[in-house]
């Protein structure tokens, strides 16, 4: 069952799933000037059995200008550098992940992918929040949100996190600093 809404927005925070439950869908989005190949699915789907989960369908982008061709356009040097950084971050994140049964890991980037990833989450999915760089986390409880089914309706639990500017006085004295900066998080998961 898909979650009706997107996870809650927390000012100056981003959210991220460590792993994606089976049934999760990811839009195949291409950056400006590119589009999905004609036969391509609009989504990738996290699917699997009891022992192994993986993403079904592969997203592929082709130049909008090219007619009836799936030829990939080589990224410009700065794009390549950007992508390499993103890939490294993704790999580092994956290395830290424990394989959860019935879950898929973050799909690797595809060529000419849009900067924003759009997920359609399913009931039972947990996402974790982090303050953006320059803001400090004040926790009242877990900085996570879970999509739950209640009385036939889906809802996300409210994450207990406030992000305050470094210069602002702390509302909760003695709070720990956030452990990591969220540079590796996709743009789509940013709450403004």
């Amino acid at each position: 069952e898909l979650c009706d809404d997107d996870p809650p927005k927390i000012t100056h925070a981003t959210f991220k799933a460590v792993a994606y439950k089976e049934g999760t869908m990811l839009n195949c989005e291409c950056k400006r000037g590119f589009r999905r190949i004609k036969s391509g699915s609009p989504y990738m789907l996290c699917t699997g059995n009891s022992s192994h989960s993986s993403w079904d369908n592969q997203c592929q982008c082709t130049s909008s200008a090219a007619r009836n061709t799936t030829k990939q356009v080589t990224p410009q040097p700065e794009e390549q550098k950007e992508r390499k950084t993103t890939e490294m971050q993704s790999q580092m994140q994956l290395a830290d992940q424990v394989s959860l049964p019935g879950h898929c890991r973050e799909p690797p980037p595809w060529e000419n992918e849009a900067t924003e990833r759009i997920y359609h989450f399913v009931v039972g999915q947990t996402v974790y929040y982090q303050c953006v760089q320059g803001y400090r986390a004040l926790h009242r409880g877990p900085a996570e949100s879970v999509c739950k089914m209640t009385h036939g309706k889906t809802r996300w639990t409210q994450p207990q996190l406030i992000c305050t500017g470094e210069t602002e006085p702390s509302q909760f004295p003695g709070e720990e600093e956030p452990q990591a900066s969220p540079d590796g998080l996709p743009e789509s998961e940013t709450s403004r």
Epitope: N27, Y43, I118, H120
Partner: nanobody
Framework: QVQLVESGGGLVQAGGSLRLSCAAS????????MGWFRQAPGKEREFVAA????????RYGDSVKGRFTISRGNAKNTVFLQMNSLKPEDTAVYYC???????????????????WGQGTQVTVSS
């Protein structure tokens, strides 16, 4: 040339129903998502509902869940918005929109739709 034409708007009493239609032509891609948005005077454009052609994903805005239903016509390029239990706060101009790719829903989604219709007025009187 892409065209989205809405119809079915009008004046209805609270508790009543309306069915909006959107006919698309000239869309240059195979798999696309179609959505409905609305805009009341002095308010931001609000996401109402969206679905892809195959009906893989259907999403609704919070305020219309359980009352509105988005569906596809027999013709691949037509979508309907069945609006039941209408309330005065549903009064707005309703716009049909289309985008290349999967469904995008939620508060920031209108920027993700490439093509827009002219809109049809829905007025719900109390």
């Amino acid at each position: 040339q892409v065209q989205l034409v809405e119809s079915g708007g009008g004046l209805v009493q609270a508790g009543g129903s309306l069915r909006l239609s959107c006919a698309a032509s000239g869309i240059p891609f195979d798999n696309y998502a179609m959505g409905w948005f609305r805009q009341a005077p002095g308010k931001e454009r609000e996401f109402v509902a969206a679905r892809d052609l195959e009906g893989i994903i259907t999403r609704y805005g919070d305020s219309v869940k359980g009352r509105f239903t988005i569906s596809r016509g027999n013709a691949k390029n037509t979508v309907f918005l069945q609006m039941n239990s209408l309330k005065p706060e549903d009064t707005a101009v309703y716009y049909c929109a289309a985008r290349d790719g999967g469904v995008v829903a939620g508060s920031r989604s209108s920027a993700q739709y490439n093509y827009w219709g002219q809109g049809t007025q829905v007025t719900v009187s109390s």
